[in-house]
């Protein structure tokens, strides 16, 4: 006869593993018992369980409660055991050794290999800001056993780099990914990925990117001097500019202080019909945690019977 | 051969324990595996508990939780510490020793265990 076992059996933390052990035995042969060991180099051999065909499993107390037979049916010529809830230290290397009649003992070795699946954590960077060089934008870190892999799912252009630590029993890899930081990235996902055999699929960790800046403000409303006379209804200054975080906007008058029946509504100025003291120099101040800007514009407020009377006397001149 | 001697049976109130003692005639680190059966009248025997020479152990459900097999090496003794008894634990416990795997077994003479409630 001959024993059939698995090189290695491989299950994932807290599983539990099946360490086969069948006797492929001749008619009219005997299992007696399968003693199951474990027999890590360097140490002795430590008594796992003892199936004996007359007086069942019996169990070490560092395995109690751990060790089971599989559930029936049951072929006498099976010494296969169960090993619950795999943890972490129960990798190693099973010895299990059968007693036969009338043909002798036989035994075989397997290898246990125990997955610990990774719990990544993603940690952003420094706050990003438009202007600043190559800046760390986040950094992902995994540990498990095996070592897992850690790369990057983004539509933004940067570079990455890796490092691994190995602990006793495990490895912890970090990647850190490093960009210039531009206003266009705002609100981009930047994800990693971990991928370990012990995961039935990649796990996703997303950040979205936030990179602090401030437009150049400029003012519109302006466009046709021609709209800006007096008695006009409905005449507006309009603020633009466009951050993150999203600014605000402050209006003053360069020459004074603001003329009576001027409504600031955030980034729009408001007047009242037009009369020859909304004239001056208006400034929008835009400002947000990052940094301000400011724009100016001249109102020059005209007066229809001057300009006609001018066009009169154009007329006339020529 | 190996000879078996057992002790520390007798009658107890329910609730309360009692010790058993097999000593064997040679050394029980060398025997295969080594425990106790009982047999009630009436009824047939049934294995209560064994402890193999690499000192992996065994206990009947029935008796889980309240008793436990040890072994002193030294004294080439096996223990069985029975606490909580019930009077359904009353029968004569016998030791038995398995020198080789596949062998038939070495018997002691039994001590009785009357559980009275």
């Known amino acids: 006869g001959e024993l059939e076992t698995s090189d290695v059996v491989t299950v994932v933390l807290g599983q539990d593993a099946k360490l086969p052990c069948f006797y492929r035995g001749d008619s009219g042969e005997q299992v007696g018992q399968v003693a199951w060991a474990r027999v890590d180099a360097g140490e002795g051999a430590q008594e796992l369980a003892l199936l004996h065909s007359k007086y069942g499993l019996h169990v070490s107390p560092a395995y109690e409660g751990r060790v089971e037979q599989p559930p029936p049916p049951r072929n006498p010529l099976d010494g296969s055991v169960l090993l619950r809830n795999a943890v972490q230290a129960d990798e190693g290397e099973y010895e299990c050794r059968v007693s036969t009649f009338p043909a002798g003992s036989f035994q075989a070795r397997l290898r246990l290999r125990v997955l610990v699946p990774p719990l990544p954590s993603l940690n952003p960077g420094p706050a990003l800001e438009e202007g600043q060089g190559l800046t760390l934008a986040a950094s992902c870190t995994a540990e498990g056993s095996p070592a897992p892999s850690v790369t990057w799912d983004t539509e933004v252009k940067g570079t990455t780099s890796s490092r691994s630590f190995k602990h006793s029993r495990s490895a912890a890899v970090t990647s850190e990914f490093h960009l210039v930081p531009s206003r266009s990235m705002n609100g981009q996902p930047l994800t990693c990925v971990v991928s370990h055999p012990g995961l039935l699929q990649d796990q996703r960790i997303t950040h979205i990117l936030h990179v602090s800046f401030l437009a150049e403000a400029s003012v519109r409303g302006l466009e046709d001097q021609n709209l800006w006379h007096i008695g006009r209804e409905g005449a507006m200054l309009k603020c633009l500019s466009e951050g993150q975080p999203p600014p605000s906007y402050n209006w003053t008058r360069l020459d004074g202080p603001l003329p009576s029946g001027v409504r600031v509504d955030g980034d729009t100025l408001g007047f009242p019909p037009l009369t020859t003291e909304h004239s001056g120099i208006y400034v929008c101040h835009v400002s947000n945690e990052f940094s301000s800007r400011d724009s100016q514009v001249t109102v020059d407020v005209l007066d229809p019977q001057e300009d006609s009377g001018k066009q009169v006397d154009l007329v006339s001149a020529s | 051969e190996v000879q078996l001697v057992e002790s520390g049976g007798g009658l107890v109130q329910a609730g309360g324990f009692l010790r058993l003692s097999c000593a064997a005639s040679?050394?029980?680190?060398?025997?295969?595996?080594m425990g106790w059966y009982r047999q009630a009248p009436g009824k047939q025997r049934e294995l209560v508990a064994g402890?193999?020479?690499?000192?992996?152990?065994r206990l009947a459900d029935s008796v889980k939780g309240r008793f436990t097999i040890s072994r002193d090496n030294a004294k080439n003794t096996v223990y069985l510490q029975m606490n909580s008894l019930k009077p359904e634990d009353t029968a004569v416990y016998y030791c038995?020793?398995?020198?080789?795997?596949?062998?038939?077994?070495?018997w002691g003479q039994g001590t009785q265990v009357t559980v009275s409630s």
């Open positions: 038995f020793a398995e020198a080789v795997v596949g062998d038939e077994p070495y």
């Open positions: 040679r050394s029980v680190f060398r025997i295969n595996v």
């Open positions: 402890i193999t020479s690499g000192g992996s152990r």
